[in-house]
Amino acid sequence: SPQNPGCPNAEDKNFPRTVMVNLNIRNRNTNSKRASDYYNRSSSPWNLHRNEDPERYPSVIWEAKCRHLGCVDADGNVDYHMNSVPIQQEILVLRREPRHCTNSFRLEKMLVSVGCTCVTPIVRHVA
Amino acid sequence: SPQNPGCPNAEDKNFPRTVMVNLNIRNRNTNSKRASDYYNRSSSPWNLHRNEDPERYPSVIWEAKCRHLGCVDADGNVDYHMNSVPIQQEILVLRREPRHCTNSFRLEKMLVSVGCTCVTPIVRHVA
């Protein structure tokens, strides 16, 4: 339940558009359970690419790129009847505002690829 | 390149721990390309569950839960020689600070499941 039931929701129109944010992260040591090798063991394997931007917080974000168009079968062959596709997610990052060196940021949406999954392609007949 | 090359990186120890953040989101209309049906077409399909918290920004986050332990084969049967596993990502959210109703937040890490992928399980022998 809300700690301050009378507070406006941060997504409300009447909410202040500029807020104070403490950068000391809570849950800093949250860890993904054993997920580190899924990118290699998946039937839709992917590589991880480092996306770095010093004007952004966090400055480093890892992006997934599917290795194959198809999916890897039980024998290790790429099967093109199925497709590897990226699973994307919108995340929020802080973008440093120009002309404000030290402590002014703006929220920014980023679409990042987190990993890949194997899907049945949609077949379309072109007239 | 940085707009303010002399500015400290927001992850530096000497960076102010409290910053001003503008909540008017840039790239608000970033859209995930046609990804909406991957959860159904995947060999490791998932359901999406709504996680809502009025003390958090964003207040609504969608979490993936794999439908099966195994993966769906070409005939639509679940094959338990492979496993559906969640692809997880750490994201940053803003958590409303207690005792500060209007405009004080703290960064918080959250581990969210974005979708599922099909992996070869690791075989372990229990002593």
Epitope: - | K65, Y80, V85, P121, R124, H125
Partner: nanobody, 115 residues
Framework: EVQLVESGGGLVQAGGSLRLSCAAS????????MGWYRAAPGKQRELVAI???????NYADSVKGRFTISRDSAKNAVYLQMNSLKPEDTAVYYC?????????WGQGTQVTVSS
């Protein structure tokens, strides 16, 4: 760390019954499967029966109608009731525990069916 505790193996005459038990502890998941595989001397390990998420079951053709797998989700345990045992059921029976991304095998319990 996952632990599997197997019990219930032994020596029985053809036509007799045994009940195998396996309890898993350490890592519990919403999606999981438990069951039994067996390896007869000089043969590869083969499926006997598995039960997924406390619901759907899968049996080897050779044991259908004779063996019954069941589950106690609260104890995270699986049971194999083996009736009308035959000499060809003689094998080491291995507990199988599958959580997303990992398969665990127990050390095995010997079942010997004498004619």
């Amino acid at each position: 760390e996952v632990q599997l505790v197997e019990s219930g193996g032994g020596l029985v005459q053809a036509g007799g019954s045994l009940r195998l038990s396996c309890a898993a502890s350490g890592v519990i998941f919403r999606l999981n499967a438990m069951g039994w595989y067996r390896a007869a001397p000089g043969k590869q390990r083969e499926l006997v029966a598995i039960i997924v998420n406390g619901g759907s079951t899968n049996y080897a053709d050779s044991v259908k109608g004779r063996f019954t797998i069941s589950r106690d989700s609260a104890k995270n345990a699986v049971y194999l009731q083996m009736n009308s045992l035959k000499p060809e059921d003689t094998a080491v029976y291995y507990c199988y525990y599958n959580i997303p991304g990992d398969v665990y095998w127990g050390q095995g319990t010997q079942v010997t069916v004498s004619s």
